[in-house]
Interface confidence: medium
């Protein structure tokens, strides 16, 4: 089948990095500068992606593969193939329509991207707050308040060793 196809279509013999030039009797011509063809049998070469503005070149364009971009420092990639760059904020902030803004009280963000999220509500799990939350860090939940009643240790004691032959209750 490949043989009959190549007899019918001389373009199928053109490898990646070339195109089938109709103006030159369907001769395989190399892709011009700043263009590429990643598969054989192409009738045109594609224009290379240009990484400009906040985009920087991660991988140069070659005759057989497109350029790849990432973002300059202070930005991170969004979208398939890094089609967008989003400005970083500091930890404890989120990006809003007014730029980077501090997280509201009761919320935190421990990354340079994304939104501020509410602190964990320890009481929902029947636990108490061991370490208070900040703009950058979530609260740390500790033992339940009942475990911290007078006379009770705030450190959970190790489980008693089971005697052989006794199954747990």
């Amino acid at each position: 089948f490949e043989r009959t196809r190549s007899l019918q279509d001389p373009c199928s013999n053109c490898p990646a990095g070339t195109f089938c030039d109709n103006n030159r009797n369907q001769i395989c011509s190399p892709c011009p500068p700043n263009s590429f063809s990643s598969a054989g049998g192409q009738r045109t070469c594609d224009i290379c992606r240009q990484c400009k503005g906040v985009f920087r070149t991660r991988k140069e364009c070659s005759s057989t593969s497109n350029a790849e971009c990432d973002c300059t420092p202070g930005f991170h990639c969004l979208g398939a193939g890094c089609s967008m760059c989003e400005q970083d904020c500091k930890q404890g902030q989120e990006l809003t329509k007014k730029g980077c803004k501090d997280c509201c009280f009761g919320t935190f963000n421990d990354q340079k991207r994304g939104i501020c999220r509410p602190w964990t509500n320890c009481s929902l799990d029947g636990k108490s707050v061991l370490v208070n939350g900040t703009k950058e860090r979530d609260v740390v939940c500790g033992p339940s308040p009942a475990d911290l009643s007078p006379g009770a240790s705030s450190v959970t004691p190790p489980a008693p060793a089971r005697e052989p032959g006794h199954s747990p209750q």
């Epitope: 985009f55 089609s83 967008m84 760059c85 989003e86 990006l95």
Partner: nanobody, 122 residues
């Protein structure tokens, strides 16, 4: 071909004023959202201000009340009026044709000028 050419930068004393201009060509300026961004020495690029085709404006908190973005569609020109300048405003200021309409987010099809240097120093 899209072209953006900034001008108006220079050396100014703290508390002084400058007006940056960005002459645009090669696209329909009046229907395009536009932005100013800046890059301080040794720092990353920071979004400063944006203006939609409707005229709605946004500013980063640090320049609010001091900077004013505006546009003259008849002249295909974007402006940034900068008052009460501070040392921390020292940066290369870039004008950009802005597609995403999301503050702080840039698309690969956005276009950028070459920038104009603003130095605030006594």
């Amino acid at each position: 071909e899209v072209q953006l050419l900034e001008s108006g930068g220079g050396l100014v004393q703290p508390g002084g004023s400058l007006r940056l201009s960005c002459a645009a060509s090669g696209f329909t300026f009046s229907s395009s959202a536009m932005s100013w961004a800046r890059q301080a020495p040794g720092k990353g690029l920071e979004w400063v201000s944006s203006i939609y085709s409707s005229g709605k404006t946004y500013y980063v908190e640090s320049v609010k009340g001091r900077f004013t973005i505006s546009r003259d569609n008849s002249k295909n020109t974007l402006y940034l009026q900068m008052n009460s300048l501070r040392a921390e405003d020292t940066a290369v200021y870039y004008c950009a044709k802005w597609k995403t309409l999301r503050v702080g987010v840039w698309d690969e099809s956005d276009y950028w000028g070459q920038g104009t240097l603003v130095t605030v120093s006594s």
